[in-house]
């Protein structure tokens, strides 16, 4: 367990020409606040997946009124850190989204209005317990400067907050195989051993010997999936024996999403999916027009010239969502043919073709037989990016240049002797057998299991295989 901490240093116009207009004015004073969303791993997802590591909202900053004629300065910021607690191990690699929101404090009917000023995102590697990392991100003409760190909550220590520390039992040294806990040299690393048999997938422990279950699992070893169907009472505690989890009040109870947004539970909270024309944490931001630039990732804003007409974002291929905020795996459309490998480069799709295929989508089958000759009357057969020769009788090898030994595979059954012949092979059958490969027994009364032998051949005579 631990806490991710974010310190915003400044938010204001970036360097270079074209400073942005101040977001506030004498007529419309406003104040800023920030939202941070964290996800584990080096996820490419921009805005759509839940903030699986957690999210936090800052306090509101001081009220700011633009000085007429002055360029937009760095805007006044909220006090304090944004803190995102994490319950489990710190993943080491994470993705972040930091949003800067403007709260307008004019005489809006129905309270203040919110609008998204800027959104920055990135992927970073970070060890828990390390120093503050400084960062600068730009969103359009705005620049955000911030620092961040991850720290473990005692008794957890280590770069992933997975090791536990305990006060020393003996004054001089730690127990066998246990190291001192830097920087707490007076404490010792504690072996974190969960209860024997505790499910590694569905259970975890914060104290040695315990087994705590992740959501959706129950039982002493967290091996029993939760079933809500066999529960009788509408509310109540979980039963470890039946595996029945009776839900308590859920984060979506009472639907916290405004303006017709739909609520879905996340491991730590809830997430609102907003109807077109609304966004924000609870779909509370409305009155958005195309002039507010609501379409992300190159989306084109259509309609929405005034607050009463809803805008639509036409999203470039590869993005979806009402604001083009969701990345789509374009390779899932399997654009590369003939087993080509798909690469989504963001601005373009590329196919890496298997041998024998070419073209932007590997749609061209190269002529594998072009310039290839099969010797000794063999014919070339194309396939899978490589040519193959179908050889005439008596020849073999890749290009039919090798003389084949037709007897090498011991084709004559029941002890028949094989002789190579210019037109194939001949089997001399052992007594009692006949057929091209000596495969048929001759009946004791002299009748064959086959129709009568062709004229001029007695059973037992060599049968030539043509």
């Amino acid at each position: 367990a631990g806490v991710f901490e974010l310190q915003i240093h400044s938010f204001g116009p970036g360097p270079g020409p074209g400073a942005p207009r101040s977001p506030c004015s004498a007529r419309l004073p406003c104040r800023l606040f920030f939202r941070v969303c964290l996800k584990p791993g080096l996820s490419e997802e921009a805005a759509e997946s839940p903030c699986a590591l957690g999210a936090a909202l800052s306090a509101r900053g001081p009220v700011y009124t633009e000085q007429p004629g002055a360029p937009a300065p760095d805007l006044p910021l909220p006090d304090g850190l944004l803190q995102v607690p994490f319950r489990d191990a710190w993943p080491g690699t994470f993705s972040f989204i930091i949003e800067t929101w403007r709260e307008e404090l004019g005489d809006q009917i129905g309270g203040p209005a919110w609008s998204l000023l800027a959104r920055v995102a990135g992927r970073r590697r970070l060890a828990a317990g390390g120093p503050w990392a400084r960062d600068i991100q730009r969103a359009g003409a705005w620049e955000l400067r911030f620092s961040y760190r991850a720290r473990c909550e005692p008794p957890a220590v280590g770069t992933a907050c997975t090791r536990l520390c305990r006060p020393r039992s003996a004054p001089s040294r730690c127990g066998p195989g246990l190291r001192p806990c830097a920087p707490l040299e007076d404490e010792c690393e504690a072996p974190l051993v969960c209860r024997a048999g505790c499910s590694p997938e569905h259970g975890f422990c914060e104290q040695p010997g315990e087994c705590r279950c992740l959501e959706g699992w129950t039982g002493p070893l967290c091996t029993v999936p939760v079933s809500t169907s066999s529960c009788l009472s509408p509310r109540g505690p979980s039963s470890a024996t039946t595996g029945c989890l009776v839900p308590g009040p859920g984060p979506c109870d009472g639907n916290p999403c405004a303006n017709g947004g739909s609520c879905s539970e996340t491991p730590r909270s809830f997430e609102c999916t907003c109807p077109r024309g609304f966004y924000g944490l609870r779909c509370e931001v409305s009155g958005v027009t195309c002039a507010d630039g609501p379409c992300f990732n190159g989306g084109l804003c259509v309609g929405g010239a005034d607050p009463d007409s809803a805008y639509i974002c036409h999203c470039p291929p590869g993005f979806q969502g009402s604001n083009c905020e969701k990345r789509v795996d374009r390779c899932s459309l399997q654009p590369c043919r003939n087993g080509g490998l798909c690469l989504d480069l963001g601005h373009a799709l590329r196919c890496r073709c298997r041998a024998g295929f070419a073209g932007p989508r590997c749609e061209h089958d190269l002529d594998d037989c072009a310039g290839r000759a099969c010797a000794n009357g063999g014919t070339c057969v194309e396939g899978g990016g490589a040519h193959r020769c179908s050889c005439a009788l008596g020849f073999g090898g890749r290009d039919c240049r090798e003389r084949a030994d037709p007897c090498a595979a011991r084709p004559c059954a029941h002890g028949g002797r094989c002789y190579a012949h210019f037109s194939g092979l001949v089997c001399a059958c052992a007594p009692g057998y006949m057929g091209a490969r000596c495969e048929f027994p001759v009946h004791p009364d002299g009748a064959s299991a086959l129709p009568a032998a062709p004229p001029g051949l007695r059973p037992g005579d060599p049968q030539r295989y043509l």
Partner: antibody
Amino acid sequence: QVHLQESGPGLVKPSETLSLTCTVSGGSISHYYWTWIRQPPGKGLEWIGYIYYSGITNFSPSLKSRVSISVDSSKNQFSLNLNSVTAADTAVYYCAGISLAGFYFDYWVQGTLVTVSS
Amino acid sequence: EIVLTQSPGTLSLSPGERATLSCRASQSVSRSYLAWYQQKPGQAPRLLIYGASSRATGVPDRFSGSGSGTDFTLTISRLEPEDFAVFYCQQYSISPLTFGGGTKVEIK
């Protein structure tokens, strides 16, 4: 690399329908938005409209009442129809591919001059 | 709709000189969704810059774009003989997609 090839008549009579077709090669038509742009002789560029294989369309408000764009994924083609043409519709007509990263144009055809005259 | 005004209409310069072309929007072009194109006589336009400042594939680094909000600039640091053409800006923030009227860069 995506390549585009335009086809259609170079001369259309007033009040008739201007029809042009653009054939896409070197890429699937389902991976891009496709657009039509025109340029009257000696003048600037004017966007006409675009289409996506899924059926999404968007047109310039000034032409919306007269224009339609369709797509035939099986032939890797998209087409422009502009009805009730007048001499003011005389222009070089370009078909183009819209970028994967935004609604700007990174694949262009050479262009076809369509003259509206009786 | 967003109206894009390009200035100057014509720019007369010599090879080796620096060219600065302006594109001004009637309202803010959000997220710097602005592109620049070059068009030579008898040819289709060619994409130079997107996102106000990102060079398209194969575009020489003497071409650069800058700006945000309502004011955007295309700069050609040192004009080459093949650079003389008409240049258009285009916004792709709000429908309808619109182009500027163009700036002709001609040899002095």
